[in-house]
């Protein structure tokens, strides 16, 4: 064998005895007749040599040391060469290393190829023999990085200050090339960056440096995972020791590219998060030890990839063919801002697109899936408009305001659905009918029911809110006079349970002049409470509603309001109140600006109040609540 | 069920020490930490220091340094702490409470009933 | 040290109301804080761990919100039995440092 080591190269080559065997006849290197059991061949030595005896492989193994020195001058990046070549080497198990000396500021990064590197621990060892043993530097201390076998995700590793990179193969190995390269990055900041890259589902080990003895006091180690979106990631701690703090305590942070979150801290005690959907960091930080007794701390964790679990691996199908004019939005609730760790949520159309909002329209059948730990953090928003063009056409025509099953099988909570109900101006007004009489909600008497019909101008210049209404109530019916936006608002998840209590039937009715009529038919049992629609922001300008209340024969109305005066102060106009009995048409009329409000008064027969408002100066709005009680007729009212 | 029983109260003269001992039940003793905390009406509440049978660790609050001691029996599953040259500030309520991990890393989510330890000449 | 700062020291109010106690910390502590209620005689009872965590048996009327240096803790419709001193922990770092604590007394 002829080694020759060109000048400048610094490179070392050194022919040792391994590991002792048990072999009878010991063996030698020969150099011109003299028998020695270590050879050095240094930078710009020629050696010729032979073994004694037939099998050297089983007595010598060979290193090969590159020194690269960036301290000096410029750093040979690029890919790393395996020199000399292995094929002018003699078959013995051999260990390229390369020892790479930087200032602090420069960062290095090692660069694997395909097959990327897999994390051993102690004890265990590479199925085809090639292990990648890989140090760093803090100052003159040298702190082991951890040792690899080929196949597995590791694929870059950063550090600073210096790194060394041992690549062991086997005698009978045949491999030619180091498989990395070197580049020069910025300062990390810390002991090591380890990217570890998931193409598919698969797990990973990973150790913190030094492992399993400590890791160095007060450093930061950072993990990288790439995770293809669709894919979810948890992270569980197999094995960790904790040293004796001085104050501030161990901890591993977890870092998600574009969450608002970042970053969130755990205890190495803590359980630690699952279902993390797409990229994040994993950072290890140490603690000032105590002098005394520093113990150690070591961590050994898994990452595992997976596709989403349980409810998530479903796939529902969404028919919305048959609809016109609706869009379904999946998007997550709003939450507070905290630093709390969220895993990702995503909705996917057709399993493959997946974000956290998905819209689907009306007209198609959607396949959809979800990638999402707890589904109770998403709800949906569906919209469904319902026109009318042609008066002709349309008048006195139904449509049922239900939700359709379809979306009531999705496992995902429904926060609104809203039906924006349109008429022709001034040719047709709508009349909501509820399949249960409807209550409104009032301070008084607020609705307990999982869900409420909240009835709006659908009008954009208009700013007026009807009320929110639920079932269980004494409201027969609500007559508006132009567009407006009908939206079921779900309040419990026991919503699916009482979906059979929603059913609203909407209806083009001839046109009318007032804004809104309510028709009450109170029940003997409870007090009817009803407000003026838009409370607490008062009734628009120039606006009338009336409530048309049933009184049965055997009955009498008390009709009471709430406080003495209306409050309203008119800039231009007149505020009234009109109250006049339907069967004789009597009628008493109110300046809600100037008079008092009658006391409680009683109707045998049915009645209608009728509230018209003028134009109110600022902040003297017109916000009336009044109540009607039924008592049966042979009560001495006096 | 998880329960930290704690000695009775002490009269003690100035000057003296005195052991206060915490025995948990219902659960693994030597799997958790045991915290020490004073409660006086002067500056309400205040962490003594953290006995970790698990980890080894034991950590004590720069005031409580040279007064308290915190030690722990495995065999009976019981905590100590002593304190020593007493005076009259260190009449309080002593709690101990478990930790909620074995490294003394966590909230405390079980205490004692407490020990009243009075000072008095 | 880190200092916890709670507010207010103490409250009045009636049953059914909401309460919300609030503790400010020196600095960032990663919303490793914990709530506990003492009430007259008895020994102190955690009710929130992690800032925002409910412990095992405490009634949903508690929560707990915040997250950096900000936290508070919630009863959303108060009861006869919730009067007492309510303290909060940090247990960031060493060493361990409590809120001056929050009189809730009923109206």
């Known amino acids: 064998f002829e080694i020759a080591l060109p000048r400048e190269s610094n490179i070392t080559v050194l022919i040792k005895l391994g590991t002792p065997t048990l072999l009878a006849k010991p063996c030698y290197i020969v150099i011109s007749k003299r028998h020695i059991t270590m050879l050095s061949i240094k930078s710009g030595e020629r050696i010729v040599f032979t073994f004694s005896c037939q099998s050297p492989e089983n007595h010598f193994v060979i290193e090969i040391q590159k020194n690269i020195d960036c301290m000096s001058g410029p750093c040979p990046f690029g890919e790393v060469q395996l020199q000399p070549s292995t094929s002018l080497l003699p078959t013995l198990n051999r260990t390229f290393i390369w020892d790479v000396k930087a200032h602090k500021s420069i960062g290095l990064e090692l660069q694997f190829s395909i097959p990327r590197l897999r994390q051993i621990g102690p004890g265990e060892s590479c199925p085809d023999g090639v292990t990648h043993s890989i140090s760093g530097r803090i100052d003159a201390t040298v702190v082991r990085i951890g040792t690899f076998c080929s196949n597995g995700t590791v694929s870059r590793i950063k550090m600073q200050e210096g790194v060394k990179m041992a690549l062991h193969l086997p005698w009978f190995h045949p491999r030619n090339v180091s498989g990395f390269s070197i580049a020069n990055r910025s300062s990390i900041k810390r002991l090591c960056i380890i990217e570890s890259v998931f193409e598919g589902e698969g797990s990973a080990t990973l150790m913190s440096a030094n492992y399993p003895e400590g890791f160095p006091e007060d450093e930061l180690m950072t993990w990288q995972f790439v995770v293809p979106a669709h894919l979810r990631a948890s992270v569980s701690f197999l094995n960790f020791n904790l040293s004796n703090c001085e104050r501030k305590e161990e901890r591993v942070e977890y870092y998600i590219p574009g969450s608002t979150t970042n970053p969130e801290v755990f205890k190495l005690e803590d359980k630690q998060p699952g279902n993390m959907a797409g990229n994040f960091n994993l950072s290890l930080q140490g603690c000032d030890q105590d002098a005394q007794s520093p113990g150690i701390l070591r961590l050994q964790f898994q990452v595992l990839v997976q596709h989403p679990q349980n409810e998530s691996n479903k796939i529902y199908v969404v028919d919305l063919s048959n609809e016109r004019a609706m869009s379904l939005t999946i998007e997550p609730r709003p939450v507070k801002q905290s630093r709390k760790f969220v895993p990702g949520c995503f909705v996917c159309l057709e399993s493959r697109t997946c974000s956290s909002n998905l819209t689907l329209t009306s007209g198609s059948k959607h396949k959809i899936s979800f990638l999402c730990d707890d589904l109770t953090r998403l709800w949906m928003n569906v919209e469904k408009t319902i026109s009318c063009t042609d008066h002709r056409y349309c008048q006195r025509k139904s449509y049922s305001l239900q939700v359709p099953s379809d979306i009531l099988h999705l496992p995902v909570e429904l926060h609104d659905f809203s039906w924006k109900l349109l008429v022709p101006k001034d040719r047709l007004s709508l009349v909501l009918v509820p399949a249960q009489k409807l209550q409104q909600h009032t301070h008084e008497k607020p609705c307990n029911t999982s869900f409420s019909y909240l009835v709006a101008s659908a009008i954009p210049s208009q700013d007026l809110y009807f009320g929110s209404f639920c079932p269980g109530g004494s409201i027969k019916q609500i007559q508006v006079k132009q567009n407006i936006s009908v939206t079921l608002r779900t309040f419990a998840p026991s919503f699916q349970q009482e979906a059979s209590r929603q059913g609203l039937t909407v209806s083009f009715i001839p046109y009318f002049k007032e804004e809104g009529v309510f028709t009450v038919t109170p029940d003997t049992k409870s007090k009817v409470y009803l407000r003026t629609p838009n409370w607490d922001r008062g009734l628009p300008s120039l606006t009338s509603v009336s409530w048309n209340i049933s009184v049965p024969r055997d009955q009498v109305a008390c009709l009471t309001f709430f406080k003495e005066r209306s409050g309203v102060v008119c800039q231009t106009g007149r505020a009234f109140m009109i109250i006049q009995e339907q069967r004789t048409r009597a009628e008493e009329i109110f300046s809600l600006d100037e008079d008092v409000l009658p006391k409680p008064s009683f109707h045998h027969h049915s009645f209608w109040v009728n509230i018209s408002n003028c134009s109110p100066t600022s902040g003297k709005q017109l916000d009336l609540l009044f109540s009607v009680t039924l008592t049966p007729r042979t009560v001495d009212l006096t | 069920q998880v329960q930290l029983q704690q000695s009775g109260p002490e009269l003690v003269s100035p000057g003296e020490s005195v052991k206060i001992s915490c025995k948990g039940s219902?659960?693994?003793?030597?799997?958790?930490?045991v915290h020490w905390v004073k409660q006086s009406h002067s500056k309400s509440l205040e962490w003594i220091g953290v006995k970790s049978v698990y980890y080894g660790i034991t950590k004590y609050s720069q005031n409580f340094k040279d007064k308290a001691t915190m030690t722990v029996d495995k065999s009976s599953s019981t905590a100590y702490m002593e304190l020593a040259r007493l005076t009259s500030e260190d009449s309080a309520i002593y709690y101990c409470a478990r930790d909620s991990y074995g490294s003394s890393r966590g909230y405390f989510d079980y205490w004692g009933q407490g020990t009243t330890l009075t000072v008095s000449s | 040290d880190i200092k916890m700062t709670q507010s207010p020291s103490s409250i009045y109010v009636s049953p059914g109301e909401r309460v919300t106690i609030t503790c400010k910390a020196s600095?960032?502590?990663?919303?490793?804080l914990s709530w506990f209620q003492q009430k007259p005689g008895k020994s102190p009872k955690t009710l929130i761990y992690r800032a925002n965590r409910l412990v095992d048996g405490v009634p949903s009327r508690f929560s707990g919100s915040g997250s950096g240096q900000d936290y508070s803790l919630t009863i959303s419709s108060l009861e006869y039995e919730d009067m007492g001193i309510y303290y909060c922990?940090?247990?960031?770092?060493?060493?361990?440092?409590f809120g001056g604590g929050t009189k809730l007394e009923i109206k």
């Open positions: 600095q960032d502590i990663n919303s490793f």
């Open positions: 219902g659960y693994t003793f030597t799997d958790y930490a």
């Open positions: 922990l940090q247990y960031d770092e060493f060493p361990r440092t």
